[in-house]
Interface confidence: low
């Protein structure tokens, strides 16, 4: 006869491991007992259990409550056992020794491999700001046994670097994703992908990129200076900028206080019917947590009568 077993039994942490040991004997042969032991190299054999054809299963104290026979029906030639709730420390070499009558003793070894699925964590790097050089966007760490694979899935251009730390029974892999921050990256997903033989499918953790920036400010409304004349209604200046976080706006006048009747409404400065006292230098101040910008314009309110007089003078002077 001969023993049938597996070279390697692989199980995920917390699952039950079936350690197979089946005696394929000739007609009339019987199995008297099956002894299971752990036989890691450099260490003495540690008994797990003894399976006796007459007296049943005896489990050694170190494995009390963790070793069982498979559920019935059972073949009397089957010396397989179940190791309940496998933990990392269970990984190693196991031996079954089968005593048969009349053929004598047989033994076989198998290796138990306990997969420890990783629970990845993603840690964002420091705040990303436009204008920075190559900056850490995020790091992703996963620890498992065997070592997991950590990669990145993103449309964003960047560079990755990985390092691995070996522990006694597992390995931790950390991958970092570096990029040069730009405003176009805002809202883009950066996904850490962890692969491992103990996972039915890859684990993915997504981080949404936020890049602080503030665009240059400009003022609209003065494109046609001729519209800024005494008596005009509805004149307004609008400050243009964009940023992340969204910016706030403030209006001031360089050469004095804002004239009475001028309304500040966020990015817009609204004027009452224009008079010459509205002439001046106006400053739009744009700011967010990242930066601040200024843009200034000169308003020159025209007096149509003065202008026509000036024009005559200019003509006569020529």
């Amino acid at each position: 006869g001969e023993l049938e077993t597996s070279d390697v039994v692989t199980v995920v942490l917390g699952q039950d491991a079936k350690l197979p040991c089946f005696y394929r004997g000739d007609s009339g042969e019987q199995v008297g007992q099956v002894a299971w032991a752990r036989v890691d190299a450099g260490e003495g054999a540690q008994e797990l259990a003894l399976l006796h054809s007459k007296y049943g299963l005896h489990v050694s104290p170190a494995y009390e409550g963790r070793v069982e026979q498979p559920p019935p029906p059972r073949n009397p030639l089957d010396g397989s056992v179940l190791l309940r709730n496998a933990v990392q420390a269970d990984e190693g070499e196991y031996e079954c020794r089968v005593s048969t009558f009349p053929a004598g003793s047989f033994q076989a070894r198998l290796r138990l491999r306990v997969l420890v699925p990783p629970l990845p964590s993603l840690n964002p790097g420091p705040a990303l700001e436009e204008g920075q050089g190559l900056t850490l966007a995020a790091s992703c760490t996963a620890e498992g046994s065997p070592a997991p694979s950590v990669t990145w899935d993103t449309e964003v251009k960047g560079t990755t670097s990985s390092r691995s730390f070996k522990h006694s029974r597992s390995a931790a892999v950390t991958s970092e994703f570096h990029l040069v921050p730009s405003r176009s990256m805002n809202g883009q997903p950066l996904t850490c992908v962890v692969s491992h033989p103990g996972l039915l499918q890859d684990q993915r953790i997504t981080h949404i990129l936020h890049v602080s920036f503030l665009a240059e400010a400009s003022v609209r409304g003065l494109e046609d200076q001729n519209l800024w004349h005494i008596g005009r209604e509805g004149a307004m200046l609008k400050c243009l900028s964009e940023g992340q976080p969204p910016p706030s706006y403030n209006w001031t006048r360089l050469d004095g206080p804002l004239p009475s009747g001028v309304r500040v409404d966020g990015d817009t400065l609204g004027f009452p019917p224009l008079t010459t006292e509205h002439s001046g230098i106006y400053v739009c101040h744009v700011s967010n947590e990242f930066s601040s910008r200024d843009s200034q314009v000169t308003v020159d309110v025209l007096d149509p009568q003065e202008d026509s007089g000036k024009q005559v003078d200019l003509v006569s002077a020529s």
């Epitope: 995920v12 942490l13 917390g14 629970l119 990845p120 039915l200 499918q201 684990q203 953790i205």
Partner: antibody, heavy 119, light 112 residues
Framework: QVQLQESGPGLVKPSETLSLTCTVS????????WNWIRQPPGKGLEWIGY???????NYNPSLKSRVTISVDTSKNQFSLKLNSVTAADTAVYYC?????????????WGQGTMVTVSS | DVVMTQSPLSLPVTLGQPASMSCRSS???????????LNWFQQRPGQSPRRLIY???NRDSGVPDRFSGSGSGTDFTLKISRVEAEDVGVYYC?????????FGGGTKVEIK
Amino acid sequence: QVQLQESGPGLVKPSETLSLTCTVSGGSISSYFWNWIRQPPGKGLEWIGYLYYIGTTNYNPSLKSRVTISVDTSKNQFSLKLNSVTAADTAVYYCARSGNYYNDAFDIWGQGTMVTVSS
Amino acid sequence: DVVMTQSPLSLPVTLGQPASMSCRSSQSLAYSDGNTYLNWFQQRPGQSPRRLIYKVSNRDSGVPDRFSGSGSGTDFTLKISRVEAEDVGVYYCMQGTHWPLTFGGGTKVEIK
């Protein structure tokens, strides 16, 4: 958003097996830890066990010999089987989600299903 | 198993007044990762439980700021700054630091 819905028979005979299913909608079961918790009438909460979506299970030692939790990712469901039930197993059974670690406990719950063990 | 003991069993309160309840664990709930996995759940009559507080003091989204959690080690407290009618129900603490996860017996909040 993610919602959980328990289903299964409301009456089970003593010594038989209690079988319940929790359907996950509004999100994938392929992440997180998925738990069963029960509450006997007028009493407190008892955690039964969890299933990590890859199939790993862990059970409360007080029930371990009788409980099995399994997953069907294609149907976005996970199930509870509790065998050899007695009247003491009469309870409202809840399914609940935990976060990326099992102890990020129970941020989403089903509405519960009452199971009575009686002949 | 870690035993979670809640007190008082019953807490009669007046609307608009503060309320406080205690949860004690038989072992420290400080975990090796630096977190303390102590959670508070609210169960209104006829409803399923709802998590209010996780990791001692972090409020879940949608939980009114009148609820606050505090404590460390083995002693923890849930406070309601001004009780409202909708706060009636049973409050459970639960530890996730030690295996297996265990709940307290609950504190029943009722209006006087």
